[in-house]
Amino acid sequence: WELTILHTNDVHSRLEQTSEDSSKCVNASRCMGGVARLFTKVQQIRRAEPNVLLLDAGDQYQGTIWFTVYKGAEVAHFMNALRYDAMALGNHEFDNGVEGLIEPLLKEAKFPILSANIKAKGPLASQISGLYLPYKVLPVGDEVVGIVGYTSKETPFLSNPGTNLVFEDEITALQPEVDKLKTLNVNKIIALGHSGFEMDKLIAQKVRGVDVVVGGHSNTFLYTGNPPSKEVPAGKYPFIVTSDDGRKVPVVQAYAFGKYLGYLKIEFDERGNVISSHGNPILLNSSIPEDPSIKADINKWRIKLDNYSTQELGKTIVYLDGSSQSCRFRECNMGNLICDAMINNNLRHTDEMFWNHVSMCILNGGGIRSPIDERNNGTITWENLAAVLPFGGTFDLVQLKGSTLKKAFEHSVHRYGQSTGEFLQVGGIHVVYDLSRKPGDRVVKLDVLCTKCRVPSYDPLKMDEVYKVILPNFLANGGDGFQMIKDELLRHDSGDQDINVVSTYISKMKVIYPAVEGRIK
């Protein structure tokens, strides 16, 4: 019996087609992805093949103005329209709190939403019961397939799930649910979830009875053969893991942003064992037409977005200096504003010993693309912020050793004076440079804000200590020459859309007046 698994993950509000790098579509003839194009390909496969499942491994939420405005209603609407069969909860599904998940998505979805390792307690247990499930048995052709969900247990550090959801260890939580499926006579089981490729592989290895793992969170691109676009494969598609009980378990992921549709064909024997698996992600490029009815619906929903862009988010009573003459040479107040917003967006009081789990921010000055003049009545709009942060990136959470941070700050000024983008703006960091010294030895003082303290204060950076830092995904991926971050990071979790982080902070503060205050000397 053959099953076709179509899968997406980490779509992050890319409902409309995007450019090749998943930013805003500029030249339509070269754009990719989007739900209208995805639907065309899904329907084509549904018509051609008998047993097809369309699955999403989480993080539909967060990433563009679509989410900012529609807050998840767009996810439910278009996933319903595409007739997804199931979705696993990702960490970003909790970005607007549990209510921001329940109201727009859980109540409206016409497909099961899954996570076996999230347990509700207190009054929330009743409120949310039955709206997401640990697993679901789906009829496919003449057979039934069990789908069991999982979500990163780091979610409380990455999003806003509140205090009434417990995120358990994935493997510990999955095993009894898989065992339950076996007692229900279900012998074909897919683990669908959002914990990253390393955990996907562990689940394949450790959870008895799981036949296939469909993952997300780490934006992993797998491919067999010559890849069709810019993404470099982390391994073959599917990636085969040998389980502890000797089975070959295919593990897949489909990069991110709706650029690819994962396509995996699995052959099962009559006892539900995987005989063979093969496939590849399908690049959703312009050779695949956008479905006209979905496209028309997208255009209808778009209208509200255009109106939103020009609405006032808040006011500034000072000039927000985002000029390259400032931000690539010295501390600039636009950099301070953005870093303050980045830290504010990551306030998570999950431990009494810590005032927060992260206190530091770094931001490449070259990523700040425009100032905002306060003389326009002080008004700040989404449109203004899109000029400051035009690249559609995210502000991510990483863990780095102090020694890596020291290297990053040396790189920040290794060719100072040439107006290059690697000059770092900061938050929760005091850095002193001596530019008379030779490159690689210019950082003379580097103090960082403590986290394990009730009164935050600055202490000297310790080379062997592990620190959490918020930074643009561009830097996490080694951009602007920060190869040491990419090579030496100990953990990387993708965060919220950059503009959304800053816009939320400005809306919260209402009036802002960031200063240049001696963070960089």
Epitope: K107, E108, A125, Q127, I128, S129, G130, D142, V144
Partner: antibody
């Protein structure tokens, strides 16, 4: 299109038995459960029980444990409910309804109903 | 067994009216609640499952909501084809139980 077609009306004497059938089409019979519900005149709907035609697991409402016997013939895609030791209070319309395999959601398609009249 | 108390038992309304039917559960059933419609001929159709979720093909004028153990079916603008009996039904624990029904009649 999912269809559940039930057998025709039955008139039975007290103490007799009756077997009501429910023929499923438009879907894979073993991929869903089958539930039985009764509606007696002037009474609220009552759930009798369900059968999983894949595993043949059966769950009864305790009230009907000695009254109803649920079976299924997968080759004929048909579910059956036999009612024994009929009494006048068993006079009702009996419905079959397709249920979720794992019972997380409930009966989504219903048969047209079979009227069973118990009269001497 | 979980008791489902449905009210009103009957109501008269006109086309275009907003109609609400409520159901109270005797204990916590979470969101494990269906709303069913029974037309005069006897045919039963599920309208809403999991308290809020509309079955496919069911008009959007039907909606479900909840406050604690009280569940509400709302018909925002009654249409001629909506005159029927409506039942709530819990599937949180065995035996599954039904409300007593609400007959929606033409005024």
């Amino acid at each position: 299109e999912v269809q559940l077609v039930q057998s025709g009306a039955e008139v039975k004497k007290p103490g007799a038995s009756v077997k009501v059938s429910c023929k499923a089409s438009g879907y894979t019979f073993t991929s869903y459960t089958m539930h039985w519900v009764r509606q007696a005149p002037g009474q609220r709907l009552e759930w009798i029980g369900y059968i999983n035609p894949n595993s043949f697991y059966i769950e009864y409402n305790q009230k009907f444990k000695d009254k109803a016997t649920l079976t299924a013939d997968t080759s004929a895609s048909t579910a059956y409910m036999e009612l024994s030791s009929l009494r006048s209070e068993d006079t009702a319309v009996y419905y079959c309804a397709r249920g979720d395999y794992d019972l997380f959601y409930d009966m989504d398609n219903w048969g047209q109903g079979t009227t069973v009249t118990v009269s001497s | 067994d979980i008791q489902m108390t449905q009210s009103p038992s009957s109501l008269s309304a006109s086309v275009g009216d907003r109609v609400t039917i409520t159901c109270r559960a005797s204990q916590d059933i979470g969101n494990s609640l269906n709303w069913l419609q029974q037309k005069p001929g006897g045919a039963i159709k599920r309208l809403i499952y999991a308290t809020f979720r509309l079955d496919s093909g069911v008009p959007s004028r039907f909606s479900g909501s909840r406050s604690g153990t009280e569940y509400t079916l709302t018909i925002s603008s009654l249409q001629p084809e909506d005159f029927a009996d409506y039942y709530c039904q819990q599937y949180a624990s065995f035996p599954w139980t039904f409300g007593g029904g609400t007959k929606v009649e033409i005024k």
